[in-house]
C-alpha cells in the first residue's frame, strides 16, 4: 500500500513540525493505525502511534509529543517539543487493521530539520 | 572543473549560514573568482562575488552579506542576514582567472533553509 509524505519539513522556531501522511487505501478500512518512526544514526525508533476509527479523531497517549487529525485517507500529524538534536527522518507507517485483509504501507520519510532558537536576552 | 558543496545547510536562528565550496583545480591558479548564486522561483540571481589571490583573504564588497576565507582549493563561505524568505538553492561558481587557461566550475548548489525566530516577549 502506497504512503505519501513530504520530503522535507522545517520545524518552527517553537519546535513544532506538521506534515500530511496520505495513503492509498485498497479497501474500505474502518480501523487504521498510524505510527511515526524516526530514523537517525542508522537507528529506527518509534516516536508515537495512534489507532483510530475512520471518521473519528486520532487519539495519541496523553504524554505523546504527537497530535493529529484525519480526513479520508489523509492524516495531519503534528510533532511538538522538537529540538535541534531531534533532526532526522520521520517515517509514516500506516496499517489498515480492520476489516481484513490487513494492509501495511510505509512512507519514504519526511526529513524534519530543527534549529534551536537563540535564548532571549535577560530582562533586567 | 568539478566543484563540491554540501547538499543542505540550516541557517542559525540568527540568520547565518556557512558552507565549504571545494574545487578540483586542474592547474596552478593564482587568481580565483568565487560567486554565490541563488536559485529560487525559476530565477538565478547573484548574491555576492569575490576575487582573491591564492593564499590571500577573500574580499567581498563592504555592503556584501557574504564573508569568506580560503585554504588551498577550499573556500569557506558565510552568508548572514538571512530570513525565511531567503530559503533557496545557493550555488557556488568558481572561475580560475589567472594564469591562462581560464576554467569554470559550478556546484550543484546548497539548499539553505532559514527559519525566522519567534520574537522575544516584551520586557516590561
Amino acid at each position: 500500500m502506497h504512503v505519501a509524505q513530504p520530503a522535507v519539513v522545517l520545524a518552527s522556531s517553537r519546535g513544532i513540525a506538521s506534515f500530511v501522511c496520505e495513503y492509498a487505501s485498497p479497501g474500505k478500512a474502518t480501523e487504521v493505525r498510524v505510527t511515526v518512526l524516526r530514523q537517525a544514526d542508522s537507528q529506527v525508533t518509534e516516536v508515537c502511534a495512534a489507532t483510530y476509527m475512520m471518521g473519528n479523531e486520532l487519539t495519541f497517549l496523553d504524554d505523546s509529543i504527537c497530535t493529529g487529525t484525519s480526513s479520508g485517507n489523509q492524516v495531519n500529524l503534528t510533532i511538538q517539543g522538537l529540538r535541534a538534536m531531534d533532526t532526522g527522518l520521520y517515517i509514516c507507517k500506516v496499517e489498515l487493521m480492520y476489516p481484513p485483509p490487513y494492509y501495511l504501507g510505509i512512507g519514504n520519510g519526511t526529513q524534519i530539520y530543527v534549529i534551536d532558537p537563540e535564548p532571549c536576552p535577560d530582562s533586567d | 572543473m568539478h566543484v563540491a558543496q554540501p547538499a543542505v545547510v540550516l541557517a542559525s536562528s540568527r540568520g547565518i549560514a556557512s558552507f565549504v565550496c571545494e574545487y578540483a583545480s586542474p592547474g596552478k591558479a593564482t587568481e580565483v573568482r568565487v560567486t554565490v548564486l541563488r536559485q529560487a522561483d525559476s530565477q538565478v540571481t547573484e548574491v555576492c562575488a569575490a576575487t582573491y589571490m591564492m593564499g590571500n583573504e577573500l574580499t567581498f564588497l563592504d555592503d556584501s552579506i557574504c564573508t569568506g576565507t580560503s585554504s588551498g582549493n577550499q573556500v569557506n563561505l558565510t552568508i548572514q542576514g538571512l530570513r525565511a524568505m531567503d530559503t533557496g538553492l545557493y550555488i557556488c561558481k568558481v572561475e580560475l582567472m589567472y594564469p591562462p587557461p581560464y576554467y569554470l566550475g559550478i556546484g550543484n548548489g546548497t539548499q539553505i533553509y532559514v527559519i525566522d525566530p519567534e520574537p522575544c516577549p516584551d520586557s516590561d
Epitope: - | T35, Q39, S42, Q43, V44, T45, E95, L104, I106
Partner: nanobody
Framework: QVQLQESGGGSVQAGGSLRLSCAAS???????????MGWFRQAPGKEREGVAA???????SYADSVKGRFTISKDNAKNTLYLQMNSLKPEDTAMYYC?????????????????????WGQGTQVTVSS
C-alpha cells in the same frame, strides 16, 4: 587558452535573416565538459537573456520570444556553434554572445541562467531596423 569568438552580426531590415557563428579554440566541445552551449543577448540597459541552447546530445531549448524563428546547431568537427535567425524583428536588436556551461541545458529555462555560464566571447552586434 579557451576562447569563443562570435561573428556574423550586422544590420538587417525587419523580416530579414542572419546566421551567427561561434568558433571555439583551445578545446573541443566533445572533450571539454561543456554540457550546454548557449546563445545569449543583451540590449542596452537590459539584463542578459537566454536565446537558445544546445546540449551535448544535441537537444535544443529556445526562449519563447524566438521559437519558430531561430535555430541553434553545432558542428563538433569544426568546433563551431551556430544561430540561424529568420524573420528578425526590431526587438531582436542586441549584442549576441555565445557561452558554455558545465551544467546541462535544463538550467537554460531559468531567469538569469547566464550566471551559470562562462567562457564568454566578445559578442557580435545585431541591429534590426523597421
Amino acid at each position: 587558452q579557451v576562447q569563443l569568438q562570435e561573428s556574423g552580426g550586422g544590420s538587417v531590415q525587419a523580416g530579414g535573416s542572419l546566421r551567427l557563428s561561434c568558433a571555439a579554440s583551445g578545446y573541443t566541445y566533445s572533450s571539454y565538459n561543456s554540457n550546454c552551449m548557449g546563445w545569449f543577448r543583451q540590449a542596452p540597459g537590459k539584463e542578459r537573456e537566454g536565446v537558445a541552447a544546445i546540449d551535448s546530445d544535441g537537444s535544443t531549448s529556445y526562449a519563447d520570444s524566438v521559437k519558430g524563428r531561430f535555430t541553434i546547431s553545432k558542428d563538433n568537427a569544426k568546433n563551431t556553434l551556430y544561430l540561424q535567425m529568420n524573420s528578425l524583428k526590431p526587438e531582436d536588436t542586441a549584442m549576441y554572445y555565445c557561452a558554455a556551461s558545465p551544467r546541462t541545458c535544463e538550467v537554460f529555462s531559468l531567469g538569469g541562467s547566464w550566471h551559470l555560464f562562462g567562457y564568454w566571447g566578445q559578442g557580435t552586434q545585431v541591429t534590426v531596423s523597421s
